[in-house]
């Protein structure tokens, strides 16, 4: 989802070239604002290089979809792990209370 920018436009040129999802470290979308009237998409690659992507490119649109899907999957996995941890903690607590009752 696009972020509202604070400063001026960032992209001098855009990149039509295909970027593989595997090489992406981060993908930021900036919504148009009074200080920059254009949508800007900035990809950070795993090697640290940053590149501006063309928001109108079909390849870029596809990349955004894949990236957002990947991010939401990772969030679900994180939440799942948190849920599992809570379950484990609850089980341990109930075990402790049982042990207290039996002593």
């Amino acid at each position: 989802t696009p972020v509202v920018r604070k400063g001026r436009c960032s992209c001098i040129s855009t990149n039509q070239g295909t970027i593989h999802l595997q090489s992406l470290k981060d993908l930021k979308q900036f919504a148009p604002s009074p200080s920059c009237e254009k949508i800007e998409i900035i990809a950070t690659l795993k090697n640290g290089v940053q590149t501006c992507l063309n928001p109108d490119s079909a390849d870029v649109k596809e990349l955004i979809k894949k990236w957002e899907k990947q991010v939401s999957q990772k969030k679900k996995q994180k939440n799942g792990k948190k849920h599992q941890k809570k379950k484990v903690l609850k089980v341990r607590k109930s075990q402790r209370s049982r042990q207290k009752k039996t002593t």
């Epitope: 436009c9 960032s10 001098i12 040129s13 039509q16 254009k38 290089v49 590149t51 501006c52």
Partner: antibody, heavy 124, light 109 residues
Framework: QVQLVESGGGVVQPGRSLRLSCTAS????????MHWVRQAPGKGLEWVAV????????GYADSVKGRFTISRDNSKNTLYLQMNSLRAEDTAVYYC?????????????????WGQGTTVTVSS | EIVLTQSPGTLSLSPGERATLSCRAS???????LAWYQQKPGQAPRLLIY???SRATGIPDRFSGSGSGTDFTLTISRLEPEDFAVYYC??????????FGPGTKVDIK
Amino acid sequence: QVQLVESGGGVVQPGRSLRLSCTASGFTFSDYGMHWVRQAPGKGLEWVAVIGYGGLIKGYADSVKGRFTISRDNSKNTLYLQMNSLRAEDTAVYYCAREGAGSSVYYYYGMDVWGQGTTVTVSS
Amino acid sequence: EIVLTQSPGTLSLSPGERATLSCRASQSVSSSYLAWYQQKPGQAPRLLIYGASSRATGIPDRFSGSGSGTDFTLTISRLEPEDFAVYYCQQYGSSPIFTFGPGTKVDIK
């Protein structure tokens, strides 16, 4: 092939105006930032101005600020440099150059395509 | 405003020799913002290196860039006859402002 062709140079008197054009071909002009760079006779390179791919980012060298204006017409694949209040020290070969794909305020890819230049002589 | 200084002004070498060109900035420059160009007489400049160390498309691997902070280097491992030219470093600064160094001329000894 990828090409930039400058035009509009010539001999002009001090204080007068001149407009340079740079016509691009062989690439999607509207995707790229563009620059003007000049070189006085026997001297080094001097950056003059930059314009972002959509025309929203602009920057000028202190030596031309307030006198020169960079603009572009993406529908015509053309970059412009409007030069007003010309001085003798503006005499130079003026090159237009393309900013590398994906350049931003975070990462600079250099000027990867250059024209052959157009000569501007300011003399009375 | 950042000022770039290049040294030496002229480098006289023979084909096959190694050339080491220096570019020094008056303030620290991010390596992401430094580029090198080659210019031959009567020709437009040509991009060699961007991001301080990444070779531009079609540039032979005898050209390499390195450095960080205020000191950057362009190295030509073995000079070919076509490498005798003037070399410029350039930096990108905020505003946006772009600055070239004064150049180093590499000529035949």
